[in-house]
Amino acid sequence: LIIGFGISGKHFITVTTFTSAGNIGEDGTLSCTFEPDIKLNGIVIQWLKEGIKGLVHEFKEGKDDLSQQHEMFRGRTAVFADQVVVGNASLRLKNVQLTDAGTYTCYIRTSKGKGNANLEYKTGAFSMPEINVDYNASSESLRCEAPRWFPQPTVAWASQVDQGANFSEVSNTSFELNSENVTMKVVSVLYNVTINNTYSCMIENDIAKATGDIKVTDSEVKRRSQLQLLNSG
């Protein structure tokens, strides 16, 4: 969370950004909010990126002005125009690329004053894991798969019954490069599992952490998975 203040004569406004993460090959959002101003025509939003000449995006007088936009962002950016009056200056970025990572500045000017705040935008790949029982194995085992991760994550197993146990000796993890030669498929197999226990497969890199849980009983298999972005305010 970064809060910036701006001073314009006696006036300053608070601009707030959150460290954001973009999943490459998807649309992303760079979050920025400011003190609302009901006079839409008096609001100017400028997004800049460190090391890039020209603007990432500009919105003023109630509409986009792309006249000074850098070619790298042409056709890819948008603000949420209907939410600007309530103080939302967040930027939508189409088809996030690894090269979009960096430090961005959200600069705001309204009739109340001006202000800006920086934002660290991280890019990578992260996806939900899916755990299945591997009945083909010689002993009962679990297979945890997640289709897209970058940078290479760590994988760890845990169980509800054997809390604190180290499963590295009874698991095998592999990383298979996907066809675009950047992201990787994560596959981890846990051997010698017992029924009536809940196992968790945790995949984590510096951008995201994902957990898949599976509970195997005599009568059913229950699954749950969740994903959280790290350092996002």
Epitope: N23, D64, R74, A81, R92, N95, S127
Partner: antibody, heavy 116, light 109 residues
Framework: QVQLVESGGVLVKPGGSLRLSCAAS????????MSWIRQAPGMGLEWVSY????????YYTDSVKGRFTISRDSAKNSLYLQMNSLRAEDTAVYYC?????????WGQGTLVTVSS | EIVLTQSPGTLSLFPGERATLSCRAS???????LAWYQQKPGQSPRLLIY???SRATGIPDRFSGSGSGTDFTLTISRLEPEDFAVYYC??????????FGQGTKLEIK
């Protein structure tokens, strides 16, 4: 050079199924958002379905939800549209298109006719 | 749901004249996500303009795009015989994800 070639369009009876293919060359399919767009005879363009570069996000227009499935095979650099429970109103030329900045490349289209 | 309305439905002009085609959105569209296409009979559509005002590769400079918010315009400064076709505007990012206008037919007078 960039090329998209659709195939699979035929005459099919209402309620039938069909799988359209789109073979891409000159670029890597998984670097771009890809869509299927259709055009009924004498009518305008209608977006049908989309798959993100990552392959993780998929959308459909309301009229085909639950009936059509978009997919891709990165190894074959191909895009597919599985069409089930076909209706007369699905009759159209189906195009696959690459979304670079706008739909910058289109296939030649394949005609799907749904009629008894 | 966002609706793009193109006008006029049909535009009849002489070669050499200036053509102005309009695309109006039912709600605000990001300029970045607004494109124009040309389609000739029996052919696939061709991207003319992206990001509201940027010409696509190989498009002659007689084609220009402008506008923002809800009102966008495609202008052909001096019509050539090959310009007579159907023109579509298209947006990305709202619901539905992609939307096309119904088209404007540009015909020879």
């Amino acid at each position: 050079q960039v090329q998209l070639v659709e195939s699979g369009g035929v005459l099919v009876k209402p309620g039938g199924s069909l799988r359209l293919s789109c073979a891409a060359s000159g670029f890597t399919l998984s670097d771009y958002y890809m869509s299927w767009i259709r055009q009924a005879p004498g009518m305008g363009l209608e977006w049908v379905s989309y798959i993100s570069s990552s392959g993780s996000t998929i959308y459909y227009t309301d009229s085909v939800k639950g009936r059509f499935t978009i997919s891709r095979d990165s190894a074959k650099n191909s895009l597919y549209l599985q069409m089930n429970s076909l209706r007369a109103e699905d009759t159209a030329v189906y195009y696959c298109a690459r979304d670079g900045v706008g739909f910058d490349y289109w296939g030649q289209g394949t005609l799907v006719t749904v009629s008894s | 749901e966002i609706v793009l309305t193109q006008s006029p439905g049909t535009l009849s002009l002489f070669p050499g004249e200036r053509a102005t085609l309009s695309c109006r959105a039912s709600q605000s569209v990001s300029s970045s996500y607004l494109a124009w296409y040309q389609q000739k009979p029996g052919q696939s559509p061709r991207l003319l303009i992206y990001a509201a005002s940027s010409r696509a590769t190989g498009i002659p400079d007689r084609f220009s795009g402008s506008g923002s918010g809800t009102d966008f315009t495609l202008t052909i400064s001096r019509l050539e015989p090959e310009d007579f076709a159907v023109y579509y505007c298209q947006q990305y990012g709202s619901s539905p994800l992609y939307t096309f206008g119904q088209g404007t037919k540009l015909e020879i007078k």
